[in-house]
C-alpha cells in the first residue's frame, strides 16, 4: 500500500538567466527511493539520480543542469522556454512509483524584481 | 571515431584477483563516464559500476562494493575494473562502456575471464 | 528494479524476412528503452534509444517501437550482416538488460 505524499515547491517564479531550485520531497513512507527521473514539459528526461549509480544528466543540459541539494535539481541560465511543468518520480520499493509536480515560470528580468518587491515575506 | 579497446583474456584461480584495462580513444576522455559491466554464460547483462575520469569517482552496485575496484589513468586515457577473490562464479566476459546521459553508446569489445583451479 | 524479458530467445529467419522481436518490463518502462545489437566478440552496438529514435549510421530497415511494458524491435528485411543477438535495455527504474535474443540462419 503506497502511504507516502509527495511535497514540491509547487508554482515558481524566477528570473530569465538566473538559477532556481526544483525539490520534491517523499514523506510519510519507510520506502526505500532506488530512482528519481526529473522529466520536462514535454516529458523529455532531464536527469535521473539512481541510488547506487549516482547522478546522471542528459547531455544537452550539462551545462545548464546542476544535480541538487539533495534529491532536487538545480536550472541555471533560464531561459523563457524553460516555463512549464517539471516532474519528479520517485521509484521506491516496496510502494511504487510517486509523481510530483512543478510549474515554473520564467520572468524577464524586470518583471521577476517587480513582482519579487511584493511578496510576502 | 570512438573506440575503447580492452585487454586480453584472463585466467585465474580461485581467491585472485584480476585487472582488466579499457583504452579509450576519439573524445574527451574525462567528459564521459565509464562503466564496467559483465555478462556471465547463459546469463543476461549486469553493471559492476561506474567512474567518472573527471573527477575519479567511482559508484558500484551493492553486490560489487566490496570487491571491485575502479580507477582511471587521465594521461592514458585508460579506465581499469578490478576484481578480488575470485570464485568460478565471475567467469564472465567483462566490457566498458561509455555512457552518454542515460544509455551506453560505445561498447569494448568485452574481456573474457576464466576463473578454474 | 524493472526487469526486461525478450521474446523469442532464438528466432530462426532468412535473408529478406521481416523479423520482429519484443521486450516487456515488469514495471512501466515510460518509453526509456534502448536496443542493441551485439555479434560474437565484438562490442554491443547502439541501434535505438529512446524506443523509436536510430541511432547515426544505423540502416533504415531498423525501427523500434512501444509504450508501457511493451517494446518491439523490427528489422524490416533481414541481411546477412544482421545475424546476431539482439537486446534491450531499460532506465526508467535501475539500468538493466533483457536476456536476449539470437537471429539464426534458418
Known amino acids: 500500500m503506497m502511504t507516502g505524499t509527495i511535497e514540491t515547491t509547487g508554482n515558481i517564479s524566477a528570473k530569465k538567466g538566473g538559477s532556481v531550485i526544483l525539490q520534491c520531497h517523499l514523506s510519510s513512507t519507510m520506502a526505500q527511493v532506488t530512482q528519481v527521473n526529473w522529466e520536462q514539459h514535454d516529458h523529455s528526461l532531464l536527469a535521473i539520480r539512481n541510488a547506487e549509480l549516482g547522478w546522471h544528466i542528459y547531455p544537452a543540459f550539462k551545462d545548464r543542469v546542476a544535480p541538487g541539494p539533495g534529491l532536487g535539481l538545480t536550472l541555471q541560465s533560464l531561459t523563457m522556454n524553460d516555463t512549464g511543468e517539471y516532474f519528479c518520480t520517485y521509484h521506491t520499493y516496496p510502494d511504487g512509483t510517486y509523481r510530483g509536480r512543478i510549474f515554473l515560470e520564467v520572468l524577464e528580468s524586470s518583471v521577476a524584481e517587480h513582482s519579487a518587491r511584493f511578496q510576502i515575506p | 571515431e570512438v573506440q575503447l579497446v580492452q585487454s586480453g583474456a584472463e585466467v585465474k584461480k580461485p581467491g585472485a584477483s584480476v585487472k582488466v584495462s579499457c583504452k579509450a580513444s576519439g573524445y574527451t576522455f574525462t567528459e564521459h563516464s565509464i562503466y564496467w559491466l559483465r555478462q556471465a554464460p547463459g546469463q543476461r547483462l549486469e553493471i559492476i559500476g561506474r567512474?567518472?575520469?573527471?573527477?575519479?569517482?567511482?559508484y558500484f552496485v551493492d553486490k560489487f562494493k566490496n570487491r571491485a575496484t575502479l580507477t582511471t589513468d587521465t594521461s592514458a586515457s585508460t579506465a581499469y575494473m578490478e576484481l578480488s577473490s575470485l570464485r568460478s562464479e565471475d567467469t564472465a566476459v567483462y566490457f566498458c562502456?561509455?555512457?552518454?546521459?542515460?544509455?551506453?553508446?560505445?561498447w569494448g569489445q568485452g574481456t573474457l575471464v576464466t576463473v578454474s583451479s | 528494479d524493472i526487469q526486461l524479458t525478450q521474446s523469442p530467445s532464438f528466432l530462426s529467419a532468412s535473408v529478406g524476412d521481416r523479423v520482429t522481436i519484443t521486450c516487456k518490463g515488469s514495471?512501466?518502462?515510460?518509453?526509456?528503452l534502448v536496443w542493441y545489437q551485439q555479434k560474437p566478440g565484438k562490442a554491443p552496438k547502439l541501434l535505438i534509444y529512446s524506443t523509436d529514435n536510430l541511432q547515426s549510421g544505423v540502416p533504415s530497415r531498423f525501427s523500434g517501437s512501444g509504450s508501457g511494458t511493451e517494446y518491439t524491435l523490427t528489422i524490416s528485411s533481414l541481411q546477412p550482416e544482421d545475424f546476431a543477438t539482439y537486446f534491450c535495455y531499460q532506465y526508467n527504474n535501475g539500468f538493466t538488460f533483457g536476456q536476449g535474443t539470437k537471429v539464426e540462419i534458418k
Open positions: 514495471q512501466n518502462v515510460n518509453k526509456y
Open positions: 567512474i567518472d575520469p573527471k573527477n575519479g569517482r567511482t
Open positions: 562502456a561509455r555512457i552518454d546521459g542515460f544509455y551506453f553508446d560505445f
